[in-house]
Interface confidence: low
């Protein structure tokens, strides 16, 4: 089975603009690609299956996404702990200032289209 987690965080040193509302724009696609790459670095263990539903919101930039793991490989607390441990590295590797991290379980069944 698969476990899903909803993750939200702020990037306080990036500016939100209207191009982040349009998935076809270069800014949206670049930010999406770089954040995806960052999560592959954070959750390197075999249980991480990927992420989906990346959304950007105003408030500097608020990032919302869903993480998928093999069932039983990680819990909400560990998802949040690993992400928080990575914040310093995110600052150095990606020049990101991350704050207001929030993680919650996504109730099953999960629709990738939602």
């Amino acid at each position: 089975g698969v476990s899903f987690f909803f993750l939200s965080f702020h990037i306080s040193n990036l500016q939100f603009n209207s191009s982040l509302e349009d998935p076809s724009t270069d800014y949206y696609q670049e930010l999406q690609r770089d954040i995806s790459e960052m999560f592959l670095q954070i959750y390197k263990q075999g249980g991480f299956l990927g992420l989906s539903n990346i959304k950007f919101r105003p408030g500097s930039v608020v990032v919302q996404l869903t993480l998928a793991f093999r069932e039983g490989t990680i819990n909400v607390h560990d998802v949040e702990t690993q992400f928080n441990q990575y914040k310093t590295e995110a600052a150095s590797r990606y020049n990101l200032t991350i704050s207001d991290v929030s993680v919650s379980d996504v109730p099953f069944p999960f629709s990738a289209q939602s």
């Epitope: 670049e30 930010l31 770089d34 310093t88 590295e89 600052a91 150095s92 590797r93 990606y94 020049n95």
Partner: antibody, heavy 123, light 111 residues
Framework: EVQLVQSGAEVKKPGASVKVSCKAS????????IEWVRQRPGQGLEWMGE????????NYNEKFKGRVTFTADTSTNTVYMELSSLRSEDTAVYYC????????????????WGQGTTVTVSS | DIVMTQSPATLSLSPGERATLSCRAS??????????IHWYQQKPGQAPKLLIY???NLETGIPARFSGSGSRTDFTLTISSLEPEDVAVYYC?????????FGGGTKVEIK
């Protein structure tokens, strides 16, 4: 003052291993990556990999994977680079360097370097 | 791997002349608006020394005659007025993707 002091020159035979140390001082050791870079005689710079002392997390250049191992001793603020199965092409100066930030914490780069350790591989 | 190509291989100029060194990446080294490229100076028998970080930021203590510019794949290190002590090899480094890669270097010499 940030300083990285490396161990002395080594002469090794082909097939042997070498272990180079890099002792850090003048900054908080745990949260900064240490990079390893080598320079063969008359050649350019080549990134070998890195270690984050606080966690022991490593990233290796695939070219050296399986032959190189980085370790860190947080009690002595020392990082080690061990290269095995040495061959003549491994004759080089090996540098450790800190991947650090400026005083405002705003930017990161490889900012401080050790003096280099010359490793000679010869039969 | 990202390939970093520096040109020219050697630059021979008179004191006071402007030196322009180029570094080209095989793919973008920009991430979230930051160009993860750095410039180093290496003199014979010495370790490299950081001059410019993130493409255009002058490292503390480096003379203002050094400057960096460029974005994504094309970068330039400029020495506005060459001094005899600037004789060295200059390297660019990308820290965008592992493995990090250096350019082959540009040797700057005085005519």
């Amino acid at each position: 003052e940030v300083q990285l002091v490396q161990s002395g020159a080594e002469v090794k035979k082909p097939g042997a291993s070498v272990k180079v140390s890099c002792k850090a001082s003048g900054y908080r050791f745990i949260p900064y990556w240490i990079e390893w870079v080598r320079q063969r005689p008359g050649q350019g710079l080549e990134w070998m990999g890195e270690i984050l002392p606080g966690t022991g997390r490593t990233n290796y250049n695939e070219k050296f994977k399986g032959r190189v191992t980085f370790t860190a001793d947080t009690s002595t603020n020392t990082v080690y680079m061990e290269l095995s199965s040495l061959r003549s092409e491994d004759t080089a100066v090996y540098y450790c360097a800190r991947y650090g930030d400026d005083t405002s914490g705003g930017y990161y780069a490889v900012d401080y370097w050790g003096q280099g350790t010359t490793v000679t591989v010869s039969s | 791997d990202i390939v970093m190509t520096q040109s020219p291989a050697t630059l021979s100029l008179s004191p006071g002349e402007r030196a322009t060194l180029s570094c080209r990446a095989s793919e973008s080294v920009n991430i979230l608006g930051t160009n993860l490229i750095h410039w180093y100076q290496q003199k014979p028998g010495q370790a490299p020394k950081l001059l410019i970080y993130h493409a255009s930021n002058l490292e503390t203590g480096i003379p203002a005659r050094f400057s960096g510019s460029g974005s994504r794949t094309d970068f330039t290190l400029t020495i506005s007025s060459l001094e005899p002590e600037d004789v060295a090899v200059y390297y660019c480094l990308q820290s965008r993707k592992i493995p990090w890669t250096f350019g082959g270097g540009t040797k700057v010499e005085i005519k």
